[in-house]
């Protein structure tokens, strides 16, 4: 089944997809679908990669990540109720029924009203020993360590706090990048 | 060291073919992205696409699909482009550029440009 | 295709200068942005790939930073041989687009 994510209307967000290159600089085709994930290909594509490039997307979705070093985690820009629904990732690699497909659920909430600006989550907390930050300022690194032997307890740990959208928010606006292995 | 030497100045009548050649040497040829960019007289720098050597893959700017082919010989390490159905706004000087995974696919050495006259 | 925005078009300069030129995504780019450099009758040549990573060789004085789709190249003391049209390029998607260019000149 599906790994749910959610995000308020007028955020962006955030929908995670992971993959290693076989070795540096070979990237596969990755598509991303409205929809889950069909036999071959991807229904309803927003975006697709090739060997080296983005060479297809609509308006409002892109890779913030380093796509080329395998993360291919999909941005959706300003959500709407409408951007609800499943979401299929489809790592191609080469070879019959070799594809990688993750079906990831998209839950858009109304946006909240708050009369306040409250303290954002301190998601190095939520992370120790795993981010690589990456500031505002001009190429200034950060480094509060490395993951050395992550297992699936961990992985799974972390996919249930990446589905709280407003941490993967404050995630992606820092710039920080989850490195797992 | 690594070298991209390009064929010379081409005069062509509105309508013809152009074939331009690109030899590299000093690094292995297959395993780099050969891009091809012109820049028109006075103006800014355009990609027409590349070829990966290795696979024979092209990508081509949509702009140009139908009238540009990119072809490359590995036993003499050279890069073809070629632009059919010339016009006179295709005067410009077109580039050989190599690009690897190393820069993200930037163009980090390029050939010394080819002069290509469009004129009736 | 993606269009990148480069201003401003001419620098007047002097020897020792700092000079900072932007260039603007018409979407995000994630850090896939490239600097060239021109100098008349000369190739380009790289010197900033994905955003803040200098080349192999290229002096210090030269920078890039940004994300998403603001984009800033600079070089801290400009010296006589910076004189050159310089061009931003996003290398994230195809067609690969190129900034206009910056041309700097003498003051």
């Known amino acids: 089944s599906e790994v749910e994510y959610r995000a308020e209307v007028g955020q962006n967000a955030y929908l995670p997809c992971f993959y290693t290159p076989a070795a540096p600089g070979n990237l596969v085709p990755v598509c991303w679908g409205k929809g889950a994930c069909p036999v071959f290909e991807c229904g309803n594509v927003v975006l697709r990669t090739d060997e080296r490039d983005v060479n297809y997307w609509t308006s409002r979705y892109w890779l913030n990540g380093d796509f080329r070093k395998g993360d291919v985690s999909l941005t959706i820009e300003n959500v709407t109720l409408a951007d609800s629904g499943i979401y299929c990732c489809r790592i191609q690699i080469p070879g019959i029924m070799n594809d990688e497909k993750f079906n990831l659920k998209l839950v858009i909430k109304p946006a909240k009203v708050t009369p306040a600006p409250t303290r954002q989550r301190d998601f190095t907390a939520a992370f120790p020993r795993m981010l690589t930050t990456r500031g505002h300022g001009p190429a200034e690194t950060q480094t509060l360590g490395s993951l050395p032997d992550i297992n699936l307890t961990q992985i799974s740990t972390l996919a249930n706090e990446l589905r709280d959208s407003r941490l993967a928010n404050d995630l992606r606006d820092s710039g920080a990048t989850i490195r797992i292995g | 060291q690594v070298q991209l030497v390009q064929s010379g100045a081409e005069v062509k009548k509105p309508g013809a073919s152009v074939k331009v050649s690109c030899k590299a040497s000093?690094?292995?040829?297959?395993?780099?992205?050969m891009d091809w960019v012109r820049q028109a007289p006075g103006q800014g720098l355009e990609w027409l696409g590349y070829?990966?050597?290795?696979?024979?893959?092209?990508s081509y700017n949509q702009k140009f699909k139908g009238r540009v082919t990119m072809t490359t010989d590995k036993s003499t390490s050279t890069a073809y482009m070629e632009l059919r159905s010339l016009r006179s706004d295709d005067t410009a000087v077109y580039y050989c550029a190599r690009s690897g995974y190393g820069n993200y696919y930037t163009m980090d050495y390029w050939g010394q440009g080819t002069t290509v006259t469009v004129s009736s | 295709s993606i269009v990148m925005t480069q201003t401003p078009k001419f620098m007047p300069v002097s020897a020792g200068d700092r000079v900072t030129m932007t260039c603007k995504a018409s979407?995000?780019?994630?850090?896939?942005v490239a600097w060239y450099q021109q100098k008349p009758g000369q190739s380009p040549k790289l010197l900033i790939y994905y955003a803040s990573n200098r080349y192999t060789g290229v002096p210090d004085r030269f920078t890039g930073s940004g994300s998403g789709t603001d984009f800033t190249f600079t070089i801290s003391s400009v010296q006589v041989e910076d004189l050159a049209v310089y061009f931003c390029?996003?290398?994230?998607?195809?067609?690969?687009?190129f900034g206009t260019g910056t041309k700097l000149e003498i003051k």
């Open positions: 000093g690094y292995t040829f297959t395993d780099y992205y």
């Open positions: 390029q996003q290398h994230y998607s195809s067609p690969s687009t």
């Open positions: 070829i990966y050597p290795n696979k024979g893959g092209t």
């Open positions: 979407q995000s780019v994630g850090n896939n």
